[in-house]
Structure formats: C-alpha cells, structure tokens
C-alpha cells in the first residue's frame, strides 16, 4: 500500500489592492493533482496579524480569500491542501504548509505618526475625524487622509480638511453612501521637507462610533398624585427610535439626584406632595440592537417645573 501524499498549494501570496487594509490571499492548485481528478480538493487557510495570539481559520474550495487586516503590523498566513477521506479510502490527507507574509515597509520614526486619532459619526450622518500632529514634527509637515470601504472603486482622499496653523488636523467626510455595517478603512500619511513621516492605519465600523443629537421636546405629565411621567422625543435624523438608549438625570428641589437608563422615550417618577421643583435632562446613545458601541449625545436642554403644586396640574413646556 503506497502512502497517499498531496502537495501544498502553489504561488501562495498576499496581494494588497490599495484598499488600506483589505487584502487578497490567493494561491494556485497544487502540482500533481491528476491522481485525484474525481476529487474536490479543499484548502485550509490560517492567517493573522503578527503579534495576534490566535489564527483565523478558513476551509474553502476557492483559490482566493479576502479579509481586513491592521497594516500597522505585519500579516502572516499559511495554507495547506486537504484531500477528503472520500478521495483516499480512509482518512483525510493534508499537505505540508505553504507560508507567506506581508507588511508595508515603514518609513519614519513611530513618533511622527498622527496622535490621538478620533472619529465620530455625528447623528449617523456626518463623519468627522480629527488628530494631533506627531511628536517633534515641524509645521511644514502635512498629513493626508485616505479612506475606503466596500462599494468604493478605490481609496479616496479627504477633500475637506480641518486645518490649524496651516496643518491638516482633521477631515470632514462627504456623504458616505451604504457605508455602515462594514469595515471602514483609513490611512493617514504625511510629508515633510525635514523628515519622513510614519503612516497610520485605522479600521472601524461607522455604526459603532455614532454620536446622536440630544433628545428634544421634554415634557412632564402628572399620572397620579405620586407619579409624574417624563417624556421626550427622538432627535431629528435617520436614527430610528428602536436604536436608542437614554440616560436621564432628575433633580428634585435641588437635592435628590436620580439617574436612570431606559430604552423608551418615557420615564415614570415617584414624587411626594412636598416636591416644589423638578428638573431633568436626557441624553441618547445607539443601543446594542443597532451597534456594538456608541458615544453618548450631549445632554438635552434642561426642562424644569417650579412654583405651583405639582399635584394640581399637567405640566408642559
């Protein structure tokens, strides 16, 4: 009985199409597959950013795979051929591994890259990114931002920079069609007469960096002698009501502070007949049903009632 062997895939490589972190892993079938013409060969692909503890593993019949990576670090990948047990009269046969690596050859000392990069998707409508210049760079240093997400033909450069002292320190993005719930890739590179500038790469999903507008139209309604219902409306914009969480801060007579987190646009408050003043503010955040993370809005304008006995009337702004 001769031992069945299979070769690893050929020409295994990582290809960078210029999408700022979205890379293609591709390969060719192994040599000498003639003996297994009736068989569907599979490939087990493992890949990771260098420094990551865990490998991502994919089993595929294709000759390519695409995924996103952190280009601030190197990438390593390995692949081998799998012959299913149906092809070998018994156990699965695996080839040896073919391995490859990819990294962007850096330039510039790390301190020259942008510092404190911060991106916020305001009200799920307007993306704004800001940064601080690298440490020790001169005023002649200018940074440029490029971005890509699936749906764009190629990476685009920012066309509306925020400037300070003649330097680009941020970008106001145009309307980004069909850009949420997918990886959004950014590269900020730079140039200087004085010294090379290190590029920085960032990846996030827009729905996870949304900062909504604050809620509006805050009102009070007396529900019973000891209950007041606080109400407000969702802010104008594209975010549906089902996507909001709210945090309320309530002050009674300048002493008691109540803080609560709710999912609806109402909150019922127990009060006493002695309550002379009631104030509350609300802020909003995209909830776990619509994103993995988010940023609290600013607090709403404060709504207060004071002067008359709260038990005697319905209170409206």
């Amino acid at each position: 009985d001769t031992e069945i062997k299979v070769n690893p895939p050929q020409d295994f490589e990582i290809v960078d199409p210029g999408y700022l972190g979205y890379l293609y892993l591709q390969w060719q079938p192994p040599l000498s597959l003639d003996h297994f013409k009736e068989c569907t060969v599979e490939y087990e692909l493992k890949y990771r950013n260098i420094g990551s503890e865990t490998w991502k593993t994919i089993i595929t019949k294709n000759l390519h795979y695409k995924d996103g990576f952190d280009l601030n670090k190197g990438i390593e990948a390995k692949i081998h051929t799998l012959l299913p047990w149906q092809c070998t009269n018994g156990s699965e046969v695996q080839s040896s591994w073919a391995e490859t690596t990819y990294w962007i050859s850096p330039q510039g000392i790390p301190e020259t890259k942008v510092q404190d990069m911060d991106c916020v998707y305001y009200n799920w409508q307007y993306l704004l990114c800001s940064w601080k210049p690298g440490i020790g760079v001169l005023l002649d240093t200018n940074y440029n931002l490029f971005y890509w997400y699936e749906g764009l033909d190629h990476a685009l450069q920012c066309v509306d920079y925020i400037k300070a002292d003649g330097q680009n320190i941020g970008c106001r993005f145009p309307y980004l069609e069909a850009s949420d719930y997918k990886d959004f890739y950014i590269c900020v590179n730079g140039s200087s007469e004085n010294k090379p500038i290190r590029s920085s790469y960032f990846t996030f999903q827009l729905q996870n960096i949304v900062k909504p507008l604050p809620p509006v139209y805050l009102t009070f309604t007396r529900e019973s002698s000891c209950e007041i219902k606080l109400k407000w409306s969702i802010p104008l914009g594209p975010i549906p009501a089902r996507c909001f969480d709210y945090e309320i801060e309530i002050r009674e007579d300048d002493t008691t502070l109540v803080t609560a987190t709710v999912e609806n646009e109402t909150y019922t408050l127990k009060t006493t007949n002695e309550t002379r003043q009631l104030c509350f503010v609300v802020r909003s955040k995209v909830n776990i049903y619509c994103s993995d993370d988010g940023i609290w809005s600013e607090w709403s304008d404060k709504q207060c009632w004071e002067g008359e006995d709260l038990s005697k009337k319905t209170l409206l702004r």
Partner: antibody
Framework: EVQLVESGGGLVQPGGSLRLSCAAS????????VHWVRQAPGKGLEWVGV???????DYNSALMSRFTISKDNAKNSLYLQMNSLRAEDTAVYYC??????????WGQGTLVTVSS | QVVLTQSPAIMSASPGERVTMTCTAS???????LHWYHQKPGSSPKLWIY???NLASGVPARFSGSGSGTSYSLTISSMEAEDAATYYC?????????FGSGTKLELK
C-alpha cells in the same frame, strides 16, 4: 540567510572623510530599512541614522550635518559618508536591518579610528 | 531626546541565581518600541527581547521582560554561564533612537 557585511573602516586624520559600505544579502533593501549604529571603544551604542526601504532617511540630528546615508538598491548596499571627522567619531560602526521597528540582524562592524 | 538609564551598571550572579536589571526612560515610551540587545566582547549586538516581553528567536525561555511607560526590566530566572554579557535597552519610539548605557552581567 540574512547577512550584513561592513567595510571601509580604517585610520583617518581629524577633519578627514571616510565612506563606509554595508553589503546586504538574504533580503532586499527595497523591502527593509537599514540602520547605522556606532560604538566607541568600551562604550555604549549610539544610533547614527536609518535609510528606509522607500529611500527616505532619518538621522540622529547631532550627527546629521556631517554624516550622509545613501544606498544602491541594484547592489543591495548601504553607505555612510562621514565628513569633518573628529576624534570622538572613533568607534566600531555597525549596520543593522530594520524589522518591525527593531534591529534584528547586525553586521560584524568596521572600526573607524580618527587620530593624527 | 529619551535618555535610558540602566541599573546596575555592573552586576555579578552565580549559576542558578535570579537576575533582574532595569531600564528607566526619561520620557514615556510605548512598550511596543522598547527592546533589549545582548552583546558579548568582540561580537556585534544581538536582538534579545523585542516589544518589552517577546523573546527573539533562539533566546532561552529563562529570559523574560516586562514594563510600561518609563520603567522596564529584563529578568533571568536562573543564571547560566553563557548569559554573561552586556545588555542594552533600546527605545525605537522617539527620534533620535537611543540605547541605555548597558548593564554588564558577570558570572560570579
């Protein structure tokens, strides 16, 4: 196998010039940056500068005006041109490959002695 | 520039002894860019520990590194004769790149 071999060291008078070479094999200077680092006799290590894979250069500003780093990708070689040499430039000069923001392979070094 | 101060400057240890040397930076340095090199007399330096705690290829597991911010250390859990050398810390974060003045480790 990755190898870096420095050459061009020797005795030079104060005020003189010298050009050191670093021949790289087992990797390409178009893919990796290479640093020059020096070590005065019995002393510690001092960074001179780096030639990045893309061709740009970073220098130790204390030495920048007198030292120039260049490379020839076709020859896979790096060079350090040193002018207006002083006694305090006496040192072993090493070239070292840059890999993931560290220096992972070093040459054996070449000794430069500046003395009258 | 970032000044790296290594202590002690010279130390000796017996085989089997635990050894710790420190490196203090004058400014905060990212742990990603703090490395240690090992050098024996007449030889070129070798990368020993990279990014604070990762052992370079071929470095024995008795070596370890730790630290963050301005304070870093290299530890040998059990000294062996071949560990006698000078160890340099190095920061790759800020220009100019700098090295510590070295800790010379001798065999007692």
């Amino acid at each position: 196998e990755v190898q870096l071999v420095e050459s061009g060291g020797g005795l030079v008078q104060p005020g003189g010039s010298l050009r050191l070479s670093c021949a790289a094999s087992g990797f390409s200077l178009t893919k990796y940056g290479v640093h020059w680092v020096r070590q005065a006799p019995g002393k510690g290590l001092e960074w001179v500068g780096v030639k990045w894979a893309g061709g740009s250069t970073d220098y130790n500003s204390a030495l920048m005006s007198r030292f120039t780093i260049s490379k020839d990708n076709a020859k896979n070689s790096l060079y350090l041109q040193m002018n207006s040499l002083r006694a305090e430039d006496t040192a072993v000069y090493y070239c070292a490959r840059d890999h993931r923001d560290a220096m992972d392979y070093w040459g054996q070094g070449t000794l430069v002695t500046v003395s009258s | 520039q970032v000044v790296l101060t290594q202590s002690p400057a010279i130390m000796s240890a017996s085989p089997g002894e635990r050894v710790t040397m420190t490196c203090t930076a004058s400014l905060s340095v990212s742990s990603t860019y703090l490395h240690w090199y090992h050098q024996k007399p007449g030889s070129s330096p070798k990368l020993w520990i990279y990014s604070t705690s990762n052992l370079a290829s071929g470095v024995p597991a008795r070596f370890s590194g730790s630290g963050s911010g301005t304070s870093y250390s290299l530890t040998i859990s059990s000294m062996e004769a071949e560990d006698a050398a000078t160890y340099y810390c190095h920061q790759y974060h800020r220009s100019p790149l700098t090295f510590g003045s070295g800790t010379k480790l001798e065999l007692k």
